[in-house]
Amino acid sequence: CKAMHVAQPAVVLASSRGIASFVCEYASPGKATEVRVTVLRQADSQVTEVCAATYMMGNELTFLDDSICTGTSSGNQVNLTIQGLRAMDTGLYICKVELMYPPPYYLGIGNGTQIYVIDPEPCPDSDF
């Protein structure tokens, strides 16, 4: 089978600081030297790009400076962290992996991770 399988956790709960981390693992059918990882958010039938990074195998993946994502890579595994999340960002986050080089190109799409974000309660004013 030429398809690339991508695995990611079904559910993740963001921290009280709005940070969510999950692992995206892919079974590579080819010997890729360049890999692109994209986090997509699916709401209803709309899919939008959250962040994307391209990395050379053996090197670290680097997101743009203004990205809300950070990550590290190890072999066929990528550890992704999304920051700055609020309750309204609760939703399905899909890990998309593309083997960009050398040809042939392969596409792998995970089933998505449902990230739940709960806004922290504001601290009550204290009298002392």
């Epitope: 089978c1 030429k2 398809a3 690339m4 399988h5 059918p29 360049e34 692109r36 994209t38 997509l40 899919v47 939008t48 790009e49 994307a52 391209t54 899909i94 998309k96 593309e98 960009m100 080089y101 040809p103 042939p104 190109y105 392969y106 596409l107 799409i109």
Partner: antibody
Framework: QVQLVESGGGVVQPGGSLRLSCAAS????????MHWVRQAPGKGLEWVTV????????HYADSVKGRFTISRDNSKNTLYLQMNSLRAEDTAVYYC???????????WGQGTLVTVSS | EIVLTQSPGTLSLSPGERATLSCRAS???????LAWYQQKPGQAPRLLIY???SRATGIPDRFSGSGSGTDFTLTISRLEPEDFAVYYC?????????FGPGTKVDIK
């Protein structure tokens, strides 16, 4: 809304060259892989080539490898196809196509006809 | 490359009838990466189904897709006059991205 408008088609002699353009609007061009798909008269669809995102990676069908070159200008939201050493079998309607974020081909231009004939 | 074969080549049916179109792959294709397109004369193809079974935006529910591995099916439950067209399957999981040769659905 997403719009793809091809231009540059026409009649060219065998061995000649032609450059097709595709003007894109209504979406963040640099976030999408952009493809060319062609259709010979009365025939089926044939994928030709793709250029990904920032333009650093591209892939071609064997039938056009070494003769066609895909490129893109993300600042102008434009995709190009430079076709050299054209053959009669390259005669087709050429479609500019957006690869959706999940991979499928969700938006197609109206197509531009390329005729290779002496 | 993955070769897609479609059958039948032509399907002659009447409005209101059920149409069943088949797409077979030369090797296993993940259902995540199988699409169906409709094309009418003089028009560009239009996406109907992606991921083997998900309907694209604005596609009526009389169109449905199913299948896995090497065998996929597009079903039109009750043909409307505007459904008479050519239908193509496509795999988009690996390059070269390939299309089937098409099935023409025409009026009996």
């Amino acid at each position: 809304q997403v719009q793809l408008v091809e231009s540059g088609g026409g009649v060219v002699q065998p061995g000649g060259s032609l450059r097709l353009s595709c003007a894109a609007s209504g979406f963040t061009f640099s976030s999408y892989g952009m493809h060319w798909v062609r259709q010979a008269p009365g025939k089926g669809l044939e994928w030709v080539t793709v250029m990904w995102y920032d333009g650093s990676n591209k892939h071609y069908a064997d039938s056009v490898k070494g003769r066609f070159t895909i490129s893109r200008d993300n600042s102008k939201n434009t995709l190009y196809l430079q076709m050299n050493s054209l053959r009669a079998e390259d005669t087709a309607v050429y479609y500019c196509v957006r690869g959706e974020l999940l991979g499928y081909f969700d938006n197609w231009g109206q197509g531009t006809l390329v005729t290779v004939s002496s | 490359e993955i070769v897609l074969t479609q059958s039948p080549g032509t399907l002659s049916l009447s409005p209101g009838e059920r149409a069943t179109l088949s797409c077979r792959a030369s090797q296993s294709v993940s259902s995540s990466y199988l699409a169906w397109y409709q094309q009418k004369p003089g028009q560009a193809p239009r996406l109907l189904i992606y991921g083997a079974s998900s309907r694209a935006t604005g596609i009526p529910d009389r169109f449905s897709g199913s299948g896995s591995g090497t065998d996929f099916t597009l079903t039109i439950s009750r043909l409307e006059p505007e459904d008479f067209a050519v239908y193509y399957c496509q795999q988009y999981g690996t390059s070269p991205f390939t299309f089937g040769p098409g099935t023409k659905v025409d009026i009996k």
